[in-house]
Amino acid sequence: TPKIVDLPDHIEVNSGKFNPICKASGWPLPTNEEMTLVKPDGTVLHPKDFNHTDHFSVAIFTIHRILPPDSGVWVCSVNTVAGMVEKPFNISVKVLPKPLNAPNVIDTGHNFAVINISSEPYFGDGPIKSKKLLYKPVNHYEAWQHIQVTNEIVTLNYLEPRTEYELCVQLVRRGEGGEGHPGPVRRFTTASIGLPPPRGLNLLPKSQTTLNLTWQPIFPSSEDDFYVEVERRSVQKSDQQNIKVPGNLTSVLLNNLHPREQYVVRARVNTKAQGEWSEDLTAWTLSDILPPQPENIKISNITHSSAVISWTILDGYSISSITIRYKVQGKNEDQHVDVKIKNATITQYQLKGLEPETAYQVDIFAENNIGSSNPAFSHELVTLPESQAP
């Protein structure tokens, strides 16, 4: 008669994929069809894989996702011409562990962080065999890095300065497939190297050839002498200049620039050690020519008393305002209405209070420090009758 061999009475498995094995001997050797596995709920499973040696048949079953409710008595069954044999065995399905809390950041420097991994309490089953601390920079397309940890307090080294990182903990229990899902994520930012940049930086055009950079007063925390280093470079040309400004000043005039050119400026506070650069600021010097006409002009949503006009403007011409001028078709030039939009970032305006059933001539032009653009063509606008929906 067949005989089931090497099957322990009790098996502990981790939830997830599970491949139980039934091994049997006997003559003739049991075939694929003659070996089954019966779950506690009575479901009969057939081998997904099968092989045999001279003395044994080995049936491999596949359960894609075994869960705690599947715990209980399973039965390996072999039924051949020589007879039938069954062997019950107990399976205990465990829940993979996952920390309930995110790790805590105790301390950070410019290249390290001290972390309390907060691995307990956790959801799921123990005992915990090992713990991993996973980390990666935010906004980087890098894979998670990890370190194995034994203590609750761990130091992460070799981090980048002034970089935001994400942290989480992964717990591993004994047995195959014992890696739990990573727990909640904590974000933190490493410190800067050197002094922080000046606060309240502001860059504004002063003239066609100058830009003015201002910042809040700097109060050093040590006795060391310090100065502000300002770097300016042209976006259009490969032209860069670094200027040293005494630490007691709160502004610098960047001169000898070119009209209608965009510059990028940044600043830092240096002592013996160099400080950390500020974010880039950009500004255009004032224009030396009239601005071009607004482009992409579109009049839409026309009703009996209103219409929406939209447009775009080109960067770099120091455009300070947009004027929409409209008048009834055929009326004198001086009988027009001017709408001045002083915020040049606005690109849409609703003309209101128009007369129904009236033809208007609409012009739109841009103004800068030199003057106004010259519209080549007027736009026609005919309001609808009050009864007519747009």
Partner: antibody, heavy 115, light 107 residues
Framework: QVQLQQPGADLVRPGASVKLSCKAS????????MNWVKQRPGQGLEWIGM????????RLNQKFKDKATLTVDKSSSTAYMQLSSPTSEDSAVYYC????????WGQGTTLTVSS | DIQMTQSPSSLSASLGERVSLTCRAS??????LNWLQQEPDGTIKRLIY???NLDSGVPKRFSGSRSGSDYSLTISSLESEDFVDYYC?????????FGGGTKLEIK
């Protein structure tokens, strides 16, 4: 001065889609709607649709929604109308016209659909 | 869609004569109406927009007017180049629609 240049004629086989062009000059192409109008031989005018080159917003006559596709190429200031699966019913003169109020018209392209 | 009924469909007149063409709108279109001229070679030109506004370069003998839902194009004194086709066009409501056209012929 404003000009809308259209090829004088085009011949297409039935079922083979055709793309008509309208090259604009003398004004800011991206600031005015462009209309397309159909005229069958000896008949009146029929509006197909319009497109605004700034953002390619398109408004189509429901009658032509499965027939006409309007596009623009801002770099060459050219408007296009593609007609799908043309039949003899699509043989006509096709005009482009500038602006929401049809202020300037192209010379028209005579499209002949014939095998 | 708004229907534009244009009359007459053809009209014979003499040089120097005063003529009027009419379009009637099936719904209220306010002043949202143009008059177009089409020459025998197919060239189309806008003569009048918004019912009564003369386009630049268009002779003063052309004028547009409105009475209720009836819109008129008047040519005060016909000249030889005026004997072509005329269409009205409404754009108050989408889709814009055209009148059936008037063929102006020399008597």
């Amino acid at each position: 001065q404003v000009q809308l240049q259209q090829p004088g004629a085009d011949l297409v086989r039935p079922g083979a889609s055709v793309k008509l062009s309208c090259k604009a000059s003398g004004y800011s192409f991206t600031s005015y709607w462009m209309n397309w109008v159909k005229q069958r031989p000896g008949q009146g005018l029929e509006w197909i649709g319009m497109i605004h080159p700034s953002d390619s917003e398109t408004r189509l006559n429901q009658k032509f929604k499965d027939k006409a596709t309007l596009t623009v190429d801002k770099s060459s200031s050219t408007a296009y109308m593609q007609l799908s699966s043309p039949t003899s019913e699509d043989s006509a003169v096709y005009y482009c016209a500038k602006g929401y109020y049809f202020g300037y018209w192209g010379q028209g392209t005579t499209l002949t659909v014939s095998s | 869609d708004i229907q534009m009924t244009q009359s007459p469909s053809s009209l014979s007149a003499s040089l120097g004569e005063r003529v009027s063409l009419t379009c009637r709108a099936s719904q209220d279109i306010g002043i949202s109406l143009n008059w177009l001229q089409q020459e025998p070679d197919g060239t189309i030109k806008r003569l009048i927009y918004a019912t009564s506004n003369l386009d630049s370069g268009v002779p003063k003998r052309f004028s547009g007017s409105r009475s209720g839902s009836d819109y008129s194009l008047t040519i005060s004194s016909l000249e030889s180049e005026d004997f072509v086709d005329y269409y009205c066009l409404q754009y108050a409501s989408s889709p814009p629609t055209f009148g059936g056209g008037t063929k102006l012929e020399i008597k």
